[in-house]
């Protein structure tokens, strides 16, 4: 089930996801001066089965000033049977998704993609917040938000984060890392509530914010 709204806006903060639940959609947006190719996909979709999750569809951008000419590049050997690829396409998601079952990793970039991605999230998705440069975080609790289903409606929990412009000499702007421990989550709302909180993501979040051990390389 898609979340009705976007995650909450926190003044002077941005949010990011570590991984994307199956059902998530990513708009195929192009940077200024480029557009989606005719008959190209409007979005990518995170789909999966019991063994792995992957992004369906390809995003393709072409110059607004020219006809649909896409420069051909040679596919990687393992990709040649699957599809013909062009420089404007986003490569397929790797098959290995074992570390986050039911989730897709970050889709690889595509040529002339817009800088900011627009996702459409599903129930159970978690996003993490940080203050933008020049602001520092005052935490009252977890700096994260989860899309939940309550009484048949979706809503995002409110991240407990305030970003202030008052700089502390010992701190980089917004340097506090997202609170990733399951214990700190406000889960007091229980009536008529269906939640799908991913503690595995939170655990991995805590680890990867320190040092990255597992990486996925996109072919």
């Amino acid at each position: 089930e898609l979340c009705d709204d976007d995650p909450p806006e926190i003044p002077h903060a941005t949010f990011k996801a570590m991984a994307y639940k199956e059902g998530t959609m990513l708009n195929c947006e192009c940077k200024r001066g480029f557009r989606r190719i005719k008959s190209g996909s409007l979005y990518m979709l995170c789909t999966g089965n019991s063994s792995h999750s992957s992004w369906d569809n390809q995003c393709q951008c072409t110059s607004s000033a020219t006809r649909n000419t896409t420069k051909q590049v040679t596919p990687q050997p393992e990709e040649q049977k699957e599809r013909k690829t062009t420089e404007m396409q986003s490569p397929m998601q790797p098959v290995d998704q074992a570390s986050l079952p039911g989730h897709c990793r970050e889709p690889p970039p595509w040529e002339n993609e817009a800088t900011e991605r627009i996702y459409h999230f599903v129930v159970g998705q978690m996003v993490y917040y940080q203050c933008v440069q020049g602001y520092r975080a005052l935490h009252r609790g977890p700096a994260e938000s989860v899309c939940k289903m309550t009484h048949g409606k979706t809503r995002w929990t409110q991240p407990q984060l305030i970003c202030t412009g008052e700089m502390e000499t010992s701190q980089f702007p917004g340097e506090e890392k997202p609170q990733a421990s399951p214990e700190g989550r406000p889960e007091s709302e229980t009536s008529c509530l269906v939640t799908t909180t991913d503690f595995q993501i939170q655990t991995e979040m805590a680890a990867t914010m320190e040092t990255s051990i597992f990486t996925t390389e996109y072919q």
Epitope: K31, R105, P108, P173, K177, T208, T211, T215
Partner: nanobody
Framework: EVQLVESGGGLVQAGDSLRLSCAAS????????MGWFRQAPGKEREFVAT????????YYADSVRGRFTISKDNAKNTLFLQMSSLRPDDTGVYYC??????????????????WGQGTQVTVSS
């Protein structure tokens, strides 16, 4: 003040390896995607590799895929580029770049808002 300082470049023989480092300061390194770009003499600056904010996902230019590995240590505010099986056409100035606040990857120059001063890599045949 945001600062990106590359190091580790040098003169090597074809087939050798090098490890570039980029020390970042003045911003929350663990929250940003990062990337490496390079500029060969007489050519435009080109994308080499990028890594997401978590350090879990990476993407490479076709010309370096399988030979180069990008990584980031969010605890030490450092970006790395491990380069192996170097070729003469890898010669150039290598730049570390910070992705903009809302950018998912440091894939194009438009995605980036801060750059290091660069480190020279020369691969002789």
């Amino acid at each position: 003040e945001v600062q990106l300082v590359e190091s580790g470049g040098g003169l090597v023989q074809a087939g050798d390896s090098l490890r570039l480092s980029c020390a970042a300061s003045g911003f929350n390194f663990g929250w940003h995607a990062m990337g490496w770009f390079r500029q060969a003499p007489g050519k435009e600056r080109e994308f080499v590799a990028t890594i997401t904010w978590t350090g879990r996902d990476t993407y490479y230019a076709d010309s370096v895929r399988g030979r180069f590995t990008i990584s980031k240590d969010n605890a030490k505010n450092t970006l790395f580029l491990q380069m192996s099986s170097l070729r003469p056409d890898d010669t150039g100035v290598y730049y570390c770049a910070k992705a903009r606040e809302r950018a998912t990857w440091a894939y194009s120059e438009d995605d980036c808002d801060y750059w290091g001063q660069g480190t020279q890599v020369t691969v002789s045949s």
